[in-house]
Interface confidence: medium
């Protein structure tokens, strides 16, 4: 019985040590954050500004409201959701899509007509920043004015109309080399992505004054790489599961391994009224032990450690992902600044 | 003599160990990078695409050229410059400046006239993205047309002219609440910043059909926060010295402390033709020993370690700053993707 009592005491002492250690870590982190904020804002001391002065100086105006409103919804801690920003996978910025064949786009002789574009599931309509159709116009022998029409194929209407215009433009071409011309098709693409069944293809016409078509729609000899294509710029903020993303603990956790703990920094509690928004934010901190292959930041860290004759101390518990906070503050010169302060929130802890 | 020989041998052996260790680290890093790239691009295996297929599919078009041309100048290693992007200090995005008093702007009765704006040295003319003057127009009782004039005070000209127009506009106001109106003053602000002596202030007039001025220039009772103000959006990419930024070593270095070593990854050497650009890139890796307070990533790490009963193994040599690479590649579906792959380059090593 004495043995189990001793074991219990050791366990209690261990928990108590862990508690004191975490308390210490919390305190250090808060003090460090205060120093960091002043230092990152290049301020020697906290601006001395009263609440009354703030009330008087703060414009009751749209741009300020917009900035402050961002903070009304308190930045949610990333540990709450099962999905978080994916900072591991590649973020797609530009997708270049070549035309493919389609049953809809057939000429009377059965040959395919240009152009039908299939879209990757990667492209979501609300993520499209820019979409350009690029067409190549063959060289001309004499100076000519070219009328370009980009038409969208639609289901035949009652009056027999099968097309609707996307864009038309006039180009003055000089003899010499052919030219690439881009046409904004963002709205059309977004419609297609919202209603894929409406994507029946497009028709490209680029007629000179004599009605000759200069657009390369199906490359002839020596015309490789001159097909029309779509250049789509997307914002890609992929999400991935928080699985394998590092442990999250709370103050009551008995976890001894490397873990992220919650820590809220309250500016009002320091009397920092000069910070207009946010009034508080979740900073978090890392604490805990690291085993060799536990929660390593890079997939190859364990390979390195296996072969490491001098690295036997092993990896340590450290922030593996940090994010900035946006801050609205008075700088003590009758100026309100809205800026971004890097690396103020611990998003993830790991052994690296 | 024997003693010094032994010492020399130990030293050689130490260097040799370090060499072997670094060789091992290099190898691990290259293998990890290959795995990372495929994994980050969500590819199970490297796309099987021939050089001929690439030649055929690759559009010979401006947007592709632009993307590829970025790689012609090989991304220079950040260790070469004495200044690098400052990822520590806050980046200013918006500065809101309230008017201050000026000797130039006096009415006949000696009361100050609105408005004179002093500018922070933080605002450089070539960093100004947007500058809006916001003015508040008091509510009207009946529908009215307001003619707004924003005038710039200048040194009196020969003909006595003291003003030049910045902007004039017509507003149709409905009864009810007052309105905030913004006016683009970017060009004026840039001129003031280039030639501060030309900043003598502005005058704001907003007259209704009866000649009443609706602009709040000096707030009356209940008009706190309705002053005119300037909202300036700036791009701020501060630089800071590489001092205290972590050590850089080369393969011949005898440095035992935590250091960044060069490592070039060559895709052509793996036969990865599906990567259009870059053909090679500088990845780098970290290696070396960590003492307690050497090169710590966060200013408070040493405080934490001092109080750490279980962290006595100390901090470890790990990337403290990583950057992405941009990549242009075929995804094997007739699509060319241009995207950003996070955390592929070690920019800085430190003990954390």
């Amino acid at each position: 019985n004495e043995g189990s009592e001793r074991e219990e005491n050791v366990e209690k002492e261990g928990l108590c040590n862990a508690c004191a250690w975490r308390q210490n870590t919390r305190y250090s982190r808060i003090e460090a954050i205060k120093i960091q904020i002043l230092s990152k804002l290049r301020l020697e001391t906290a601006p001395n500004i009263s609440k009354d002065a703030i009330r008087q100086l703060l414009p009751r105006a749209p741009p300020l409201r917009e900035l402050i409103d961002q903070y009304d919804v308190q930045r949610d801690d990333s540990s709450d959701g099962s999905l978080e920003d994916d900072d591991y996978h590649a973020t797609t910025e530009t997708i270049i899509t070549m035309p493919t064949e389609s049953d809809f786009l057939m000429q009377a002789d059965g040959k395919p007509k240009c152009c039908f574009f299939k879209f990757s599931s990667k492209i979501q309509y609300n993520k499209v920043v820019k979409a350009q159709l690029w067409i190549y116009l063959r060289p001309v022998k004499t100076p000519t004015t070219v009328f370009v029409q980009i038409l969208r194929l639609i289901k035949p209407m009652k009056d027999g109309t099968r097309y609707t215009g996307i864009r038309s433009l006039k180009l003055d071409m000089s003899p010499g080399t052919g030219i690439w011309q881009s046409i904004d098709v963002k709205t059309v693409l977004q419609n297609w992505l919202k209603q894929p069944e409406s994507n029946l293809g497009i028709e490209i016409k680029a007629l000179d004054e004599n009605g000759h078509d200069l657009a390369v729609t199906f490359p002839g000899p020596g015309e490789d790489g001159l097909n029309p294509f779509l250049e789509v710029k997307v914002t890609d903020t992929p999400k991935r599961s928080r699985r394998d993303f590092g442990l999250d603990c709370d103050e009551h956790s008995t976890e001894s391994r490397c873990c992220r703990y919650p820590l809220t920094v309250d500016f009002e509690a320091f009397g920092w009224d000069w910070i207009i928004a946010p009034k508080r934010y979740k900073a978090n901190y890392c604490s805990g032990e690291c085993e060799f292959v536990f929660l390593q930041k890079y997939p190859h860290t364990h390979l390195v450690h296996q072969a490491n004759p001098r690295g036997s101390a092993g990896p340590c518990c450290t922030p593996t992902k940090m994010s900035p906070i946006n801050m609205l503050y008075f700088n003590g010169k009758e100026q309100i600044i809205y800026g971004k302060i890097p690396a103020m929130v611990v998003d993830r802890c790991g052994c690296s | 003599n024997e003693g010094s020989e032994r010492e020399e041998n130990v030293e050689k052996e130490g260097l040799c160990n370090a060499c072997a260790w670094r060789q091992n680290t290099r190898y691990s890093r290259i293998e990890a990078i290959k795995i990372q790239i495929l994994s980050k691009l969500r590819l199970e295996t490297a796309p099987n695409i021939s050089k001929d297929a690439i030649r055929q599919l690759l559009p010979r078009a401006p947007p592709l050229r632009e993307l590829i041309d970025q790689y012609d100048v090989q991304r220079d290693d950040s260790s070469d410059g004495s200044l690098e992007d400052d990822d520590y200090h806050a980046t200013t995005e918006t500065i809101i400046t309230m008017p201050t008093e000026s000797d130039f702007l006096m009415q006949a009765d000696g009361k100050p006239k609105c408005c004179f704006f002093k500018f922070s040295s933080k605002i450089q003319y070539n960093k100004v993205v947007k500058a809006q003057l916001w003015i508040y127009l008091r509510p009207v009782k009946t529908p009215t047309t307001v003619f707004v004039q924003i005038l710039r005070l200048i040194k009196p000209m020969k003909d006595g002219t003291r003003y030049t127009g910045i902007r004039s506009l017509k507003l149709d106001m409905s009864p009810g609440t007052g309105i905030w109106q913004s006016i683009d003053v970017k060009t004026v602000l840039q001129n003031w910043l280039k030639q501060p002596e030309s900043n003598l202030g502005i005058e704001i007039k907003a007259l209704d059909e009866n000649g009443h001025d609706l602009a709040v220039t000096f707030p009356g009772p209940g008009e706190d926060g309705l002053n005119p103000f300037l909202e300036v959006k700036v791009t701020d990419t501060p630089k800071r010295s590489r001092r205290d930024f972590g050590l850089d070593c080369d393969e011949h270095s005898t440095e035992s402390r935590c250091c960044r070593y060069p490592l070039t990854v060559d895709f052509e050497a793996f036969g990865w033709d599906w990567i259009i650009a870059p053909k090679r890139y500088k990845a780098n890796y970290c290696s070396g020993e960590c003492e307690f307070v050497f090169l710590q990533k966060y200013p408070h790490t040493h405080l934490v370690h001092q109080a750490n009963p279980r962290g006595s193994a100390g901090p470890c040599c790990t990337p403290t700053k990583m950057s992405p690479i941009n990549m242009l590649y075929f995804n094997g579906k007739e699509q060319i993707i241009y995207g950003k792959i996070p955390a592929m380059v070690v920019d800085r090593c430190g003990c954390s």
Partner: antibody
Framework: QVQLVQSGAEVKKPGASVKVSCKVS????????IHWVRQAPGKGLEWMGG????????IYAQKFQGRVTMTEDTSTDTAYMELSSLKSEDTAVYYC????????????WGQGTMVTVSS | DIQMTQSPSSVSASVGDRVTITCRAS??????LAWYQQKPGKAPKLLIY???DLLSGVPSRFSGSGSGTDFTLTISSLQPEDFANYYC????????FGGGTKVEIK
């Protein structure tokens, strides 16, 4: 070079209809938009409507809605404008004009067709 | 409907004079505005499109400016062959013409 050649002058009685033709030569008719503009003696230009030779779709000025019909015959590269229920105030020179696309200026004009409405 | 108001309705000028004709749209039409020249008994001829782009073959003494609602046609140095009627036309949605300006010899 693209040219628009219109049919000859017409004299019509009030209440009758008139059909003016506009033949396109020297270019691909199907790419053009043909608009119709009229000008009463001593007055300014008045837009009546247009037709896309490509799709056959039409757009009419509100003033002429229900009284004007614009058609095209791709086999002869000809556009037509028919105005019904003629009144004396319809006496004018009627021009056809080519637009490169629906929303565009008129870069090539026909020579005009004089239509006189008189009892 | 967007109305196009052209002024003046007539202008008397001499060879070498600078002549300015204005055209106002009742609503913003961006730069969807063309200017035409019409001589007696002839069809109109397009001079300027997109408010300021001179058609090829049109002398450089003609210039156009403006955007939104206010537009100007300027003849920098009037020549004998420039005496004619001038019309502005908006060509966004349903096209419509201004009332015209007669440039006559003083």
């Amino acid at each position: 070079q693209v040219q628009l050649v219109q049919s000859g002058a017409e004299v019509k009685k009030p209440g009758a209809s008139v059909k003016v033709s506009c033949k396109v030569s020297g270019g691909t008719f199907s790419t053009f938009h043909i608009h119709w503009v009229r000008q009463a003696p001593g007055k300014g230009l008045e837009w009546m409507g247009g037709i896309s030779a490509y799709s056959g779709s039409t757009i009419y000025a509100q003033k002429f809605q229900g009284r004007v019909t614009m058609t095209e015959d791709t086999s002869t590269d000809t556009a037509y404008m028919e105005l019904s229920s003629l009144k004396s105030e319809d006496t004018a020179v009627y021009y056809c004009a080519r637009a490169r696309y629906v929303d565009d200026a008129f870069d090539i004009w026909g020579q005009g067709t004089m239509v006189t409405v008189s009892s | 409907d967007i109305q196009m108001t052209q002024s003046p309705s007539s202008v008397s000028a001499s060879v070498g004079d600078r002549v300015t004709i204005t055209c106002r749209a009742s609503e913003d039409i961006s730069n969807f505005l063309a200017w035409y020249q019409q001589k007696p008994g002839k069809a109109p001829k397009l001079l300027i499109y997109a408010a300021s782009d001179l058609l090829s073959g049109v002398p450089s003494r003609f210039s156009g400016s403006g955007s939104g609602t206010d537009f100007t046609l300027t003849i920098s140095s009037l020549q004998p062959e420039d005496f004619a009627n001038y019309y502005c036309q908006k060509y966004i949605s349903a096209p419509s013409f201004g009332g015209g300006t007669k440039v006559e010899i003083k």
